[in-house]
Interface confidence: low
């Protein structure tokens, strides 16, 4: 975290030879330069007087499928590839005996990560040419010379963002399970600036260190049932495309503002990182949007504060906990970090001190709950499937792929006895082994709530007997009255809502005048109209970034940058008693509705947003005219 | 408006082969597929071939091995390579963009004025 260059060394070390155990086809004889790295791996090293065996399995998921690199060819020009099946060198696991033990290494050259032993975080590197077999350090990171690191975030900012900080809400939950819901997958971009790419001083050197750290972080968020897949790195070997500042809140702001001109032609993404080797001010190492994941300004600043990965990998990690609404842990009344005091603090610390934190407290873990419950976060449902993974399907990686009926992570990690992990088929005599309508291997019986009522627009989902997932989410009838609109797909879409999602918390509907126009290209207002579903008309707030705008007066429409295209009302708007915007005019409720469809539900259901039954508790679609479990036994099916 | 300018059809031998190529300008967002249909005389338009967002691809049975699809995310375009052409390949060949403005609105849809490929026994 030491602002100072070169990089601070180790204080204390132990030297050991690491030893790789023999495994079935592990291409030893093989020339190294044809890069051919085993899935599984297993290495034993005497550190610390114990001899700690380390089994490892290559992260399939570090990268996308459609991963791309930029950075520009030697006549200037910006060049964009898609490496092609590549092999790397980057695994993660365990420690052979210490049930919640992690390890994140590379054995690109020599073996260099961490890997973890109850509180103990430790760090290995080489210290020669000697490859695997060579001279390496294994060493803590509070030996590593350094200076504290803290976060930019204020607390200032974090406050309103956050709402209230009660000890109440971290209630922690019991053992050290896993959040029972499904895995969420960030799919990472990553810039690395000028500086850091002088300091390292070559692309392959910046691939490697880059590969290293969101190996890292990727495992640090497996224990929050997360994943970070890394769907593009651009390297700034030639120049920045914008000027870091040593001032991050500055930085930052560059940051995303270059993102959102860049998006149409570059990655789309959940989540953009910018790596800098410019010092920060002071001692902040980095520096986030709160609660912003998904959106445009979904983004952070990371200085490479250590010569070791992990230093910038646990930066990257807080950083990114903010872009998921976590605060930090001292600003929270009864926060629980479960980490041996001496040990060190966990990742949403202010400031780093002089150990890396190795996991999430109580309630970061909270926070990502209460974020994940939002609209705004469904960007990080989206598995990536097969296509996106490089190296086909992957018993253990977390995904249930082709030839699959559960997947609950490699053998040592997983806790799910209804899934044989090593052969990713159910264990015998089980049903199922993932689904909210699953539950101690057997399907749920019908009528169990999967998924409650989420606001006013929303309908409750209920297992139905046969399935382990609970059924697709359902909406309550477009045209059903809700907070100052209508519901529509499970929206309740209001003018003042709409100019709040693009200008922010400040953002109000224009006056009713505005809507009186529609505009042309070039800003210029055309002829009248006599409703509110043209252009969107804002008035307040702050200005998207990359957005340009239109003003007549005090109405304020976004358009795209040629100035040919308005953001719309959307479609389902209210635009007056028993009104709704409907293909771009205001029109009766009624186009919602082909028929009286509830009437068919024969009183044991409502009609849902597709005009279909959702049928209460117990009740067979599709007229909900019979009880489930008359239509099981007539169907003698089970699940 | 997206506008999807065809080019590279024309007339070839059986056996032969043809790159056609989609170039898609204007108010682009988020592609979520590109793909290549075709329709020959007194016949339904079909499917050919498709390509995703995350670079899967799906082709109709009959050009499978024959035919490949690709694109090029940075210049909005898609190809179509088509080899070992026989004459029921025949047809006009039209290019459709699938998008959405924003993550998960709704699908807008766009299509080429087509292009003609004939392949001549």
């Known amino acids: 975290i030491a602002p100072s260059r070169p990089w601070a060394l180790m204080e204390q070390y132990e030297v050991v030879l690491p030893w790789r155990l023999p495994g079935p086809r592990v291409r030893r004889a093989l020339p190294s330069h044809l890069g051919l790295h085993p899935e599984r791996v297993s290495y034993v090293l005497g550190a610390t007087g114990h001899n700690f065996t380390l089994h490892l399995r290559k992260n399939r998921d570090l990268l996308g499928s459609g991963y791309t690199e930029t950075y520009t060819a030697a006549n200037g020009s910006e060049v964009t590839e898609q490496p092609r099946g590549q092999d790397h060198c980057f695994y993660q696991g365990h420690v052979e005996g210490y049930p919640d033990s992690a390890a994140s290494l590379s054995t690109c050259a020599g073996l260099r990560g961490f890997f973890q032993v109850g509180s103990d975080l430790h760090l290995i590197e080489p210290l020669d040419e000697g490859g695997e077999g060579g001279r390496h350090a294994v060493y803590q990171a509070e030996h590593l010379l350094q200076t504290a690191g803290t976060c930019g975030v204020s607390d200032d900012s974090l406050g309103s963002l956050l709402g209230p900080r009660t000890a109440a809400v971290f209630r922690p939950r019991p053992g050290d399970s896993l959040p029972s819901r499904e895995t969420r997958y960030v799919e990472l971009y990553v810039v690395v600036d000028n500086a850091e790419f002088q300091m390292l001083g070559s692309e392959a050197a910046v691939r490697h260190r880059v590969l290293e750290v969101v190996n890292h972080v990727d495992k640090l968020y497996q224990k929050l049932n997360f994943r970070v897949v890394l769907v593009g790195l651009e390297i700034w070997n030639s120049q920045d495309r914008f000027h870091v500042s040593p001032d991050p809140s500055v930085t930052l702001e560059n940051l995303l503002t270059w993102q959102a001109r860049q998006r149409t032609r570059r990655h789309l993404h959940d989540n953009v990182q910018l790596i800098t080797g410019v010092d920060f001010t002071g001692t902040t190492v980095g520096f986030a949007r709160v609660s912003a994941m998904c959106s445009h300004s979904s983004g952070a600043v990371n200085q490479d504060h250590s010569k070791n990965p992990v230093g910038v990998a646990c930066t990257m990690a807080h950083e990114m906990g903010h872009n998921l609404g976590m605060d930090h842990d001292e600003n929270v009344q009864g926060c629980r970090c479960q980490e041996r005091f001496e040990a060190g603090r966990c990742i949403m610390a202010g400031s780093i001190g002089s150990s890396f934190p190795r996991m999430f407290s109580d309630c970061s873990q909270a926070y990502l709950e209460s974020f994940l419950e939002r609209p705004q976060s469904v960007c990080l449902a989206n598995a990536p499937d097969l296509s996106h993974l490089v190296g086909g399907p992957v018993c253990g990686n977390l995904f249930v792929e082709r030839g699959e009926q559960c997947d609950c992570g490699p053998p040592e990690d997983c806790r799910n006895r209804c899934c044989n992990s090593t052969t990713c088929q159910l264990a015998e005599g089980a049903q199922c082994a993932h689904g909210t309508c699953c539950q101690e291997c057997k399907v749920k019986p019908a009528g169990e709530l999967c998924r409650p009522k989420k606001d006013m627009c929303d309908l409750e989902e209920f297992c139905d007997g046969r399935h382990p997932e609970c059924p697709e989410d359902a909406f309550q009838e477009n045209g059903t009255p809700c907070s100052g609109g209508y519901c529509y797909n499970g929206a309740c879409p209001t003018l003042a809502q709409q100019c709040q999602a693009f200008w922010g918390p400040g953002g109000q509907a224009a006056e009713e005048s505005c809507f009186s126009y529609d505009i042309l290209p070039g800003c210029k207002a055309s002829r009248y109209r006599a409703d509110m579903c043209g252009v969107l008309q804002c008035k307040g707030g702050q200005q998207p970034l990359g957005r340009a705008i239109c003003i007549v007066d005090v109405c304020h429409a976004l358009t795209t940058e040629d100035g040919t295209a308005y953001e719309p009302v959307p479609e389902g708007t209210r635009c007056g008693p028993e009104k709704v915007c409907w293909k771009g005019r205001c029109q009766d409720l009624h186009v919602y509705r082909s028929s009286n469809c509830s009437a068919q539900c024969h009183n044991h259901g409502v009609c849902n947003h597709k005009q279909e039954c959702h049928c209460h508790a117990g009740w067979a679609p599709p007229h909900c005219a019979k009880l489930l479990t008359e239509v099981h036994a007539a169907s003698g099916s089970l699940p | 408006e997206v506008q999807l300018v065809e080019s590279g059809g024309g007339l070839v031998q059986a056996g032969g082969s043809l790159r056609l190529s989609c170039a898609a300008s204007?108010?682009?967002?988020?592609?979520?597929?590109m793909a290549w249909h075709r329709q020959a005389p007194g016949k339904q338009r079909e499917l050919v071939a498709a390509?995703?967002?995350?670079?899967?691809?799906n082709y109709l049975d009959f050009v499978k091995g024959r035919f490949t699809i690709s694109r090029d995310n940075f210049k909005n375009t898609v190809y179509l390579q088509m080899n070992s052409l026989k004459p029921e390949d025949t047809a006009v060949y039209y290019c459709?963009?699938?998008?959405?403005?924003?993550?998960?609105?709704?699908?807008?849809?766009?299509w080429g004025q087509g292009t003609q490929v004939t392949v001549s026994s």
């Open positions: 459709n963009l699938i998008q959405r403005r924003a993550p998960y609105s709704r699908l807008e849809t766009y």
């Open positions: 204007g108010n682009i967002f988020r592609i979520e597929t």
């Open positions: 390509i995703r967002r995350d670079e899967m691809t």
